[in-house]
Interface confidence: low
């Protein structure tokens, strides 16, 4: 399987909410001994391998933000811990999973990575990740809503916070 990042760049105004999205592309084994873990973390560019460094998102580690379920099941993170930090990661039945960050500040700017691990019990795992950049802007040049740039082309798309989940 692979992980697709529909958007490689998100440009948002300060104070806005944004939902960063990844998509799990098949084939996905739905056997009873197959477990999927999905999570998010921050990283930095200029490394030997993108996303190899794992830094917290608003002080929450990738362990704190993980989703655990089999196949294409829906799941949510532990609400109390994440929501206290203005975060929520979620997953739907179609392989899409996301992290929502509320009330963005300039400190949220950076490289974000989604990670999917397929674990077949008593066998090796398969790990894949996707990367995307978030730029939070302030001042008169900042957009009024988040602008996203698709990974496959340079066309941009204007989105509002509550519509993010529909852009898959």
């Amino acid at each position: 399987f692979k992980v697709a990042t529909p958007y490689s760049l998100y440009v948002c105004p300060e104070g806005q909410n944004v939902t960063l999205t990844c998509r799990l592309l098949g084939p996905v084994d739905k056997g009873h001994d197959v477990t999927f873990y999905k999570t998010w973390y921050r990283s930095s560019r200029g490394e030997v391998q993108t996303c190899s460094e794992r830094r917290p998102i608003r002080n929450l580690t990738f362990q704190d933000l993980h989703l655990h379920h089999g196949g294409h099941q829906a799941a949510n993170t532990s609400h109390d811990l994440a929501q206290r930090h203005g975060l929520e990661s979620a997953s739907d039945h179609h392989g899409n999973f996301s992290i929502t960050m509320r009330n963005l500040t300039l400190l949220d700017s950076g490289l974000y990575c989604c990670l999917v691990v397929e674990i077949r019990h008593h066998h090796s795992e398969h790990r894949v990740h996707g990367a995307m950049e978030l730029q939070v802007q302030t001042g008169k040049d900042a957009p009024s809503n988040c602008v996203v740039y698709p990974s496959s082309s340079q066309e941009s798309e204007n989105i509002t916070a509550h519509h993010h989940h529909h852009h898959h």
Partner: antibody, heavy 121, light 108 residues
Framework: QVQLVESGGGVVQPGRSLRLSCAAS????????MHWVRQAPGKGLEWVAH????????YYADSVKGRFTISRDNSKNTLYLQMNSLRAEDTAVYYC??????????????WGQGTLVTVSS | EIVLTQSPATLSLSPGERATLSCRAS???????LAWYQQKPGQAPRLLIY???NRATGIPARFSGSGSGTDFTLTISSLEPEDFATYYC?????????FGQGTKLEIK
């Protein structure tokens, strides 16, 4: 700072049992996978067992499978290794090690100082 | 089981010299899931390098890792007195997780 403190080692006769403990502090224990690694006197390192962050999955080296049981109590921030049917070749310093991941294994980023287990008649 | 073979078993060098330690796997270690540890007598191992080439937090820049597939190398560019120890490679690609037998770096 992160601290892992092993205890429970000692001298035991072949065929007997022993339980090792590893008390963790300085990090969110319940978010990390953990391992036991051992080192026979004058020898190299040998991975023994691995447990997921929530205790739901456990993996063992063939040399200890069926004899050793890894477990954890997240409410007490403690990792355990129950060792049954001990053999002379189990004599080693046993290290508790934190995994950098929470389920599947990555590298071991923190280690305890170890506890010595001697199996001898 | 992936068998890791380290060479040389012992390496005798002087402070200031460059040390090159090798770790060869019996089968390919996918995604470079290989780590290096340093261990001094009476102490626990310490993580130096992960994912074959990434330095762990607090590890000096003189330590570097390279390689992929079946051949991996740990290089210490200019040896400091505190670097004389035993070094182990470890793969975390598949169960059982295995270590090399170690390379002892001693003062010449």
């Amino acid at each position: 700072q992160v601290q892992l403190v092993e205890s429970g080692g000692g001298v035991v006769q072949p065929g007997r049992s022993l339980r090792l403990s590893c008390a963790a502090s300085g990090f969110t224990f319940s978010s990390y996978a953990m391992h036991w690694v051992r080192q026979a006197p004058g020898k190299g390192l040998e991975w023994v067992a691995h447990i997921w962050y929530d205790g739901s999955n456990k993996y063992y080296a063939d040399s200890v499978k069926g004899r050793f049981t890894i477990s954890r109590d997240n409410s007490k921030n403690t990792l355990y290794l129950q060792m049954n049917s001990l053999r002379a070749e189990d004599t080693a310093v046993y290290y508790c090690a934190r995994d950098s991941g929470f389920y599947e294994s990555y590298y071991f980023d923190e280690w305890g100082q170890g506890t010595l287990v001697t199996v001898s008649s | 089981e992936i068998v890791l073979t380290q060479s040389p078993a012992t390496l005798s060098l002087s402070p200031g010299e460059r040390a090159t330690l090798s770790c060869r796997a019996s089968q390919s270690v996918s995604s470079s899931y290989l780590a290096w540890y340093q261990q001094k007598p009476g102490q626990a191992p310490r993580l130096l390098i992960y994912d074959a080439s990434n330095r762990a937090t607090g590890i000096p820049a003189r330590f570097s890792g390279s390689g992929s597939g079946t051949d991996f190398t740990l290089t210490i560019s200019s040896l400091e007195p505190e670097d004389f120890a035993t070094y182990y490679c470890q793969q975390y690609n598949s169960y059982p997780y295995t270590f090399g037998q170690g390379t002892k770096l001693e003062i010449k």
